[in-house]
């Protein structure tokens, strides 16, 4: 979704996203030729940055408003290129598809790991979450598992009553040829969720980042 | 600082119900997995609940599945345990404690109330 | 369910000295579930150590925890007049998150 145009303007920066580009100058002037552990320097920006005073962050968070501005401004100006609106057509009274086991302990841990390294980007969030999840004893995990098998079962009952039911036509034009093998079709909407459970998350993840912004 | 206190303990007759509360400070109570711990006098420890930090998922010990009720107030940094057709063997101690990540490891205990179960 | 055997029940021991304490599975566990507290006559358990050998922020580094498998094992070195305490490990690996039965510390 405009990932790869170059003309996108480069999306807004936050306060401690200017504070850690800072910290990682520094410390490439300090030690231009030492490798960054990053889990051991995003620990400790995100320490400083928590024993920062308001005044000295004050810097930093008008350089995240004039970043803002400047977005802001870029982003009146920026067209989309023509094929970035919706592949297909989503019916928006389909089934959502179920979320898996770890998508449901992510929606329980996600907000610590983001409260505890304010500065991790989406990726190095999942990772953390990633690593928290492999640590799980299987115990643990059962009643996501659980959940996650319980919704599962009832998305299966539900997406057969709307396969059912025949979808609006809109959607039949949009998706699906009429000479597809069934197979295909069925493949073809898996796929077509999971983007959905993806968008979701991404989604989740952009809203959680505003309501850092505004923190 | 970061405290657990419970309360809600006291002398209860074979049968009878008690709800425990303990109310959390100096963090984020939200984030964590919270856990009620017992101890019998002179007894070791055992592990009797769990919650997660949205509270959407629970689990018990065999010996007080379907008897005893864990759940938890967010806003207001409170997790209880509703014990219910108590017995004099769960006469003890009761902590509630916060689990290390999402590993039983527990890293802030509560003082712990005390629960008798007799007639 | 997982059984977790502690011995010696009592250890005498004199501020200053070192002490071994063991801890056994009925079988084989993962050490990165498994945990060590101690616990002081009226007061409630203090996290040690968890993972087998990590130490929580606050705890001295005259506590350290080793051992897989079955075996595990918490030294004390250099005892000092607060460590004279019940010590208690604990696997949390699988329900119901089973605690050893104790080894009491006392002072000689």
């Known amino acids: 979704m405009g990932k790869g145009d170059p003309k996108k303007p480069r999306g807004k920066m936050s306060s401690y996203a200017f504070f850690v580009q800072t910290c990682r100058e520094e410390h490439k002037k300090k030690h231009p030729d030492a490798s960054v552990n990053f889990s051991e320097f995003s620990k400790k920006c995100s320490e400083r940055w928590k024993t920062m005073s308001a005044k000295e962050k004050g810097k930093f968070e008008d350089m995240a408003k004039a970043d803002k501005a400047r977005y802001e401004r870029e982003m009146k100006t920026y067209i989309p290129p023509k094929g970035e609106t919706k592949k297909k057509f989503k019916d928006p009274n389909a089934p959502k598809r179920p979320p898996s086991a770890f998508f449901l302990f992510c929606s329980e841990y996600r907000p610590k790991i983001k409260g505890e390294h304010p500065g991790l980007s989406i990726g190095d969030v999942a990772k953390k979450l990633g690593e928290m999840w492999n640590n799980t004893a299987a115990d643990d995990k059962q009643p996501y598992e659980k959940k996650a098998a319980k919704l599962k079962e009832k998305y299966e009952k539900d997406i057969a009553a709307y396969r059912a039911k025949g979808k609006p036509d809109a959607a039949k034009k949009g998706v699906v040829k009429a000479e597809k093998s069934k197979k295909k079709k069925e493949e073809e909407e898996d796929e077509e969720d999971e983007e959905d459970e993806e968008e979701e998350e991404d989604e989740e993840d952009e809203d959680e980042e505003e309501d850092d912004d505004d923190e | 600082e970061v405290q657990l206190l419970e309360s809600g303990g006291g002398l209860v007759q074979p049968g009878g119900s008690l709800r425990l509360s303990c109310a959390a400070s100096?963090?984020?109570?939200?984030?964590?997995?919270m856990t009620w711990v017992r101890q019998a006098p002179g007894k070791g420890l055992e592990w009797v609940s769990s919650?997660?930090?949205?509270?959407?998922?629970?689990s018990y010990a065999d010996s007080v599945k379907g008897r005893f009720t864990i759940s938890r107030d967010n806003s207001k940094n409170t997790l209880y345990l509703q014990m219910n057709s108590l017995r004099a063997e769960d006469t003890a101690v009761y902590y509630c404690?916060?689990?290390?990540?999402?590993?039983?490891?527990?890293?802030?205990w509560g003082q712990g109330t005390m629960v008798t179960v007799s007639s | 369910d997982i059984q977790m055997t502690q011995s010696p029940g009592t250890l005498s021991l004199s501020p200053g000295e070192s002490g071994t304490l063991s801890c056994r599975a009925s079988e084989s566990v993962s050490s990165r579930h498994f945990a060590w507290y101690q616990q002081k006559p009226g007061q409630a358990p203090r996290l040690l150590i968890y993972g087998a050998s990590s130490r929580p922020t606050g705890i001295p580094d005259r506590f350290s925890g080793s051992g897989s498998g079955t075996d595990f094992t918490l030294t004390l070195s250099r005892l000092e007049p607060e460590d004279f305490a019940v010590y208690f490990c604990q696997y949390y690996g699988s329900s119901p998150y089973t605690f050893g039965g104790g080894t009491k510390v006392e002072m000689k």
């Open positions: 919650i997660s930090p949205s509270g959407g998922f629970t």
């Open positions: 404690a916060r689990d290390l990540d999402i590993r039983h490891a527990f890293d802030i």
């Open positions: 100096g963090f984020t109570f939200s984030w964590y997995k």
